[in-house]
């Protein structure tokens, strides 16, 4: 398939090229009339219909004022201001002010809440697969597949720090070399983008709020991804995140540290653990070929437990077989020796849902799992419509400013540095890149933060998670302190490596122009945004984990053809796009190719097709279970009563009229139900702070 | 307390046999194993074999095997050793039993008095 | 079968003084070694086991020391009723062999 699906003729500036958001085309096609276009790139027909009689401001605009949709939009003040409030309006509207934060803190809470249940719901369904994954002993040798290991074992378990743990444990108990590490390390951060990735998702009911959200989140995707893509076989040839880390380990003599500081699990943690408790420690054993472990359940039933390392005598054939020639000894009948045991006792149970259920794992995953993205999803619309209320006037334009201003000159260059920095800063006060990046990405979506401000601070993110580790390792036992710390160290040194090649310099910023390109697929045709998800974080990791196990030769066989047919449709994009007159003219375009392979259209037919039987039975009650279907399908008869799938009829017979985008209008309010995104009954009067 | 009381002397002829006893009290006869030592006047101590009450298995050292036979009433908590086929002068000793503690490294931490037996003709 | 070879063989020595005796092992026990004082008439009494471990009543000017092939019975400060004879003995393997014994007397 073509890079830039849809594309008939090659363009000079393919970053302006969008597919089929609203208000995207160059020029706006005849009011009039419906347009058929004829020619081979098989342009949509396009309708008009009537709109309502408060839309006379010009709908239909010109092409300059809407033809970049990632101009953020600006969301005007629909409510009274406040120097025309009485007493009682301004008291009134500052409890409203005050409920609002108390709800917006209570729905981020629960938000955060969720994402750590995902990861245990993960943990529960695919936690034992993880750890045998890292059982595969090609991994010393193969670092491709250590790198797809980390990505799926991250993937599996939604933590990139459950995985790293587990590397840190097997390097220390010398399954494991520093050296076979690093490409794990490498996957586990690929792996652990995933999760702002899904919060995404949650965003697909408004078609430009999706554009950004999906394209905010998968920057982290494109640049860890990178990062590997140039750092990996650098690290094969040169291994200099192994020497660098080994002589900064070997030049301190470290003392152990305390433990790295718990700041947002202190408050998440007493609501986590009445839901579920895991025993992460069976991960890692399985990891470490315990056999025993295979049969445990991660699910954590005894909270409290009584561990007595006792001696007990055990016979043997001869004193040949004692387990020390110290300790052994006959009573002139049998031969004894003594053996270490340790006894467990069981004192009191965990106080969680699941402890007295005695389900599996994978049902309770499965329960958990559904049940954390529901809250996911509901947390995430609850975010974005108290953001959506309070951010507007003067209290957004603060915001924006504030955020997305650079220094003045000839500072404007640090800004992203300083972005960098509050980003890993966030990071580590919250403990977790995903939770940091999850949050990050509705606030991209309502239009707050711009993806180019997004991009520091995510990287910033991949750095602060970093430093987490390193405190981690430093807290470590004598035995696992120079290995952990040696790993946090080339996770540090990685993620430093990527930010030097894909940041300091505007041009190499490739992760946001790939983030946008697939923003602008997605947000037209918002199945590929799963079908992305599927394609780069299960089957290509599984596909090369599959094909590693078949042996070097035939990853190399089917490998290198594969390789080198994306690096000859790259090189003839990039040619197409820059100076198309070198190419013969058949290749100047794509229409040499079949339709499909050059157009997600007619995929989506396919797609359309295959999740038409879920449009009869999409469910309007709910909101969330509506996002879910438009995700799918698209689908605007089902959700019209809920109101969360945008451009219904448009979406549903493809037209591509340049509608003006919100920022457009004089009321926000208007410029939604114009869209209908909200009903008429919502144009109440708005209270905003300022 | 513990005791272990042996049988009284015995004078025996030459190729005859003796059994003698060890009656025990005072603890779980089947938690313990019964040693016999031999002690030669005059001499040192001389492990002859050892049984388990509670399942009846035996070892005895190489020089006495086929000749000694250690035996055990759990009904009576007695243990017995029989010195059977022709006893000889050499064998005119003073027999021991002791207890050990089964799956305990605490050696013989209990004897009989001894039972005193003369080969004469 | 391993030898347990003890010396000296008898001792004459005052109340009060410092008693040692040493038991030779012909091939490394370990410290499965037990030491046993036995009085003129009277049967083997357990003293020492495991090389070092004193039995329950033994006072604690016994004590015992070694591991391997070399054990020690050290009397702190001989007491007129230590008068007896000393045996070591061996359960590291099968059979169970104890010293010659070392027969302790005061002048």
């Known amino acids: 398939m073509a890079p830039w699906p849809e594309l008939g003729d090659a363009q000079p500036n393919p970053d302006k090229y969008l597919e089929g958001a609203a208000g995207q085309q160059p020029t706006a096609p005849d009011k009039s009339k419906e347009t058929n276009k004829t020619d081979n790139t098989e342009a949509p027909v396009t309708k008009i219909e009537l709109l309502p009689s408060y839309s006379t401001a010009t709908l239909i605009d010109e092409p300059t004022e809407v033809d970049d949709p990632w101009n953020l939009p600006t969301l005007q003040d629909s409510g009274i201001k406040w120097s025309e409030r009485d007493t009682k309006g301004k008291i009134l509207c500052f409890f409203q002010g005050i409920g609002r934060l108390i709800l917006l803190l209570g729905f981020l809470y629960f938000f955060v809440c969720s994402l750590d249940i995902l990861s245990s719901a993960f943990q529960l369904v695919g936690g034992k697969m993880a750890g045998q994954f890292f059982s595969n002993s090609s991994i010393m040798s193969n670092p491709l597949l250590g790198l797809v290991i980390g990505v799926l074992v991250t993937v599996l378990v939604q933590s990139s720090s459950t995985s790293t743990s587990i590397v840190v444990s097997m390097v220390s108990s010398s399954l494991l070399t520093v050296r076979a590490a690093i490409p794990i390390i490498m996957g586990a951060n690929i792996g652990t983008s995933i999760t702002n990735t899904i919060v995404a998702l949650m965003q697909v009911g408004d078609r430009s709020e999706f554009r950004r959200a999906f394209a905010g989140a998968t920057v982290h995707d494109f640049f860890n991804w990178l990062s590997v893509l140039v750092l990996l076989p650098v690290e094969v040839a040169t291994h200099y995140l192994e020497i660098i880390t080994q002589l900064i380990v070997e030049s301190f003599h470290f003392k152990n540290g305390e433990d790295a500081p718990d700041l947002l699990k202190v408050i998440t943690k007493p609501f986590t653990k009445l839901i579920v408790q895991l025993d992460k420690k069976v991960i890692s054993q399985i990891a470490m070929n315990d056999e025993k472990a295979k049969n445990k359940s991660l699910v954590k039933i005894w909270c409290k437990t009584f561990t007595n390392k006792t001696q007990i005598n055990v016979t043997v054939p001869s004193t040949a077989n004692c387990t020390s020639p110290s300790l052994c000894w006959t009573d002139g009948i049998q031969n004894w020796t003594m053996k270490n045991v340790t006894y467990k006792e069981n004192i009191a149970k965990c106080q969680h849902i699941f402890v007295n259920f005695h389900l599996p794992d994978l049902a309770v995953g499965t329960i958990l799992l559904i049940l954390s993205l529901l809250v996911l999803c509901g947390c995430l619309i609850m975010i974005v419509k108290i953001l959506g209320s309070v951010l507007k006037g003067q209290v957004a334009t603060v915001i924006k400013k504030t955020i997305n201003t650079d220094f003045p000159f000839p500072f404007a260059w640090l800004t992203g540095y300083l972005a960098i920095l509050v980003g890993a800063g966030m990071t580590f006060i919250v403990q977790s890149s995903s939770v940091f990046t999850s949050a990050l990405t509705p606030l991209i979506g309502i239009g707050v933060i711009t993806i180019e401000r997004a991009y520091p601070l995510t990287l910033g993110s991949n750095i602060g998670t970093t430093t987490t580790a390193i405190l981690a390792a430093l807290a470590s036992p004598g035995n696992a302190l120079r290995s952990s710390l040696q790993i946090a160290l080339c996770h540090f040194f990685f993620n430093i490596s990527g930010i030097l090649l894909w940041y300091p310099i505007p041009f190499t910023r490739l992760p946001i122009r790939m983030a946008k390109g697939l923003g602008n697929i997605s947000a037209k045709y918002r199945w590929f945004a799963v079908f992305y998800l599927i394609i780069f974080f299960f089957l290509i990791p599984l596909t090369v984990f599959g094909l590693s196990l078949a042996g070097w030769r035939v990853l190399v066989g089917v490998g290198v053809p594969v390789v080198f047919i994306i690096i000859l449709v790259l090189c003839l994009r990039l040619l197409q796009s820059r100076c198309p007159r070198v190419l013969p003219k058949k290749l100047q375009n794509w229409n040499f190719l079949p339709l499909w392979m050059r157009s997600l259209k007619p995929w989506d037919a396919v797609v359309s097709k295959f999740t038409g039987c879920f449009q009869m039975r999409c469910c309007c009650c709910c909101r969330v279970c509506c996002r879910a279907c438009c995700l799918l399908c698209d689908c605007p008869k089902c959700c019209r009563c809920s109101k969360c799938c945008e451009d219904l009829e448009e979406a549903q017979e493809g037209q591509d009229v340049p509608v003006k985008a919100p920022e457009t209008f004089d009321n926000i309010t208007i410029s939604r139900e114009a869209q209908g995104e909200v009903p008429a009954s919502d144009s109440k009067t708005e209270c905003t702070a300022l | 307390q513990v005791q272990l009381v042996q049988s009284g002397a015995e004078v025996v002829k030459p190729g005859s046999s003796v059994k003698i006893s060890c009656k025990t009290s005072?603890?779980?006869?089947?938690?313990?194993?019964i040693h016999w030592v031999k002690q030669s006047p005059g001499q040192g101590l001389e492990w002859i074999g050892g049984i388990i009450p509670n399942n009846d298995v035996t070892n005895y050292k190489q020089n006495f095997r086929g000749r000694a036979t250690l035996t055990a009433d759990k009904s009576t908590n007695t243990a017995y050793m029989e010195l059977r086929s022709s006893l000889r002068s050499e064998d005119t000793a003073v027999y021991y039993c002791a207890r050990w503690r089964n799956a305990y490294y605490s050696a013989m931490d209990s004897w009989g008095q001894g039972t005193t037996v003369t080969v004469s003709s | 079968d391993i030898q347990m070879t003890q010396s000296p063989s008898s001792l004459s020595t005052s109340v009060g003084d410092r008693v040692t005796i040493t038991c030779t092992a012909s091939q490394d026990v370990g410290t499965a070694v037990a030491w046993y004082q036995q009085k003129p008439g009277k049967s083997p009494k357990l003293l020492i086991y495991?090389?070092?471990t004193r039995h329950t009543g033994v006072p604690e000017r016994f004590s015992g020391s070694g591991s391997g092939t070399d054990f020690t019975l050290t009397i702190s400060s001989l007491q007129p009723e230590d008068v007896a004879t000393y045996f070591c003995q061996q359960y590291r393997t099968s059979p169970l062999t104890f010293g010659g014994g070392t027969k302790v007397e005061i002048k």
């Open positions: 005072g603890f779980f006869f089947t938690e313990y194993i």
């Open positions: 495991w090389a070092s």
